[in-house]
Interface confidence: low
């Protein structure tokens, strides 16, 4: 359960991979596509609104957070659209939705011991947003080796 419906804080940041590729969003045929690409230096990075929520219960058994509390985030690159986990297709998609947001839009935020974070599906513990063949996908990770998978590490920059 998420403590309170309102986020405890929000921030606007651009999202890039461990290898410094940018996560970009493009409107195509009335739907948003998500790309992982090398940006030319002069091109502006897309920003994502991260809304942080506090949850009282760990989403998976792997390495409990401090006092069992965790931060959950939702990611919105543009008004009314949120990143969502599609566990059946192992995909990450952008969907237009109204609040209250569905569980698929919530991700447990893992602060990693680099300048990186990871996003674990609230609905599927042990499954993370990751990079696969130059697009975002859901990747199952053995969480106990929590620095191991570079493809699930992301950098947030203002």
């Amino acid at each position: 359960s998420i403590t309170g419906i309102s986020p405890i804080t929000e921030s606007l940041a651009s999202l890039s991979t461990y290898n410094d590729q940018s996560i970009t969003f493009a409107l195509e045929d009335e739907s948003y596509e998500i790309y992982v690409e090398d940006l030319k230096k002069d091109k502006k990075k897309d920003k994502v609104l991260l809304s942080y929520y506090e949850s009282q219960h760990p989403s998976s058994e792997s390495g409990d957070g401090v006092d069992g509390k965790m931060l959950m985030v939702t990611l919105s690159p543009t008004k009314d659209f949120w990143l969502q986990a599609n566990n059946k297709e192992h995909s990450v998609e952008l969907h237009k939705c109204e609040k209250p947001l569905p569980d698929q839009a919530f991700f447990v935020l893992h602060n990693r011991s680099f300048n990186c974070v990871s996003f674990e599906c609230k609905t599927d513990p042990g499954v993370f947003i990751g990079v696969k063949d130059n697009h975002l996908a859901l990747i199952k990770v053995d969480y106990s080796e929590n620095l191991g998978s570079e493809n699930i590490l992301f950098k947030l920059s203002e």
């Epitope: 804080t9 760990p58 058994e61 792997s62 390495g63 409990d64 957070g65 401090v66 006092d67 965790m70 931060l71 447990v108 935020l109 893992h110 602060n111 990693r112 011991s113 680099f114 300048n115 969480y143 106990s144 080796e145 929590n146 620095l147 191991g148 950098k155």
Partner: antibody, heavy 119, light 110 residues
């Protein structure tokens, strides 16, 4: 009760060796990154080394690289620090600490064990 | 010398508000979460604040943390005699691939 208990400290001569142990209880040890942190008498905290849950990822402070070796035995719920070529400046209280993996914060600390390097 | 810079000492009278600063760089505080620890004389450090501004369960709300750019701070309001201790900040440093602590601040309650 979640607990970390260090042992193995003592007096050792410069150039000597010592092996510290940290026994964990009350939590699933095999799921956590573990760290050693030390504190010289009257000084601040200094991070020494860390090891991932399955020993795949190991990091050391420059000051101990090549002399100290961190290891763990998940079947025994125990963390180790093998200290070789000890110097006077290694004299300190050595703490083992658990990294709360979702937080990058040391949420559980042992009580510490004193290592004195002196002739 | 510590990578993160803290004032060596701070003081205040009971009831006062005291702030302890922790200054770093873009490779540590600028990019990573900061945590704060309290160490009472003769005891192991104790976690107070994690993820830069999240108070650990059981820690009085008199303690609060914040982060801006490459600096972080710990604020203690309604100072009490039992707050007299050493306080340390902590972060991961990307360039060093190491944990870095501040040098510690000795808080005296006058």
């Amino acid at each position: 009760e979640v607990q970390l208990l260090e042992s193995g400290g003592g007096l050792v001569q410069p150039g000597g060796s010592l092996r510290l142990s940290c026994a964990a209880s009350g939590f699933t040890f095999s799921r956590y990154y573990m760290h050693w942190v030390r504190q010289a008498p009257g000084k601040g905290l200094e991070w020494v080394s860390s090891i991932s849950a399955r020993s795949s990822y190991i990091y050391y402070a420059d000051s101990v690289k090549g002399r100290f070796t961190i290891s763990r035995d998940n079947s025994k719920n125990t963390l180790y620090l093998q200290m070789n070529s000890l110097r006077a400046e290694d004299t300190a209280v050595y703490y083992c600490a658990r990294l709360a993996t979702r937080r990058d914060a040391f949420d559980i600390w042992g009580q510490g064990t004193l290592v004195t390097v002196s002739s | 010398q510590s990578v993160l810079t803290q004032p060596p000492s701070a003081s205040g009278t009971p009831g006062q508000r005291v702030t302890i600063s922790c200054s770093g760089s873009s490779s540590n505080i600028g990019r990573n979460a900061v945590s704060w620890y309290q160490q009472l004389p003769g005891t192991a450090p104790k976690l107070l604040i994690y993820a830069s501004n999240m108070r650990r369960l059981g820690v009085p709300d008199r303690f609060s943390g914040s982060k801006s750019g490459t600096s972080a701070s710990l604020a203690i309001s309604g100072l009490r005699s039992e707050d007299e201790a050493d306080y340390y900040c902590w972060a991961w440093d990307d360039s060093q691939k190491a944990v870095v602590f501040g040098g510690g601040t000795k808080l005296t309650v006058l």
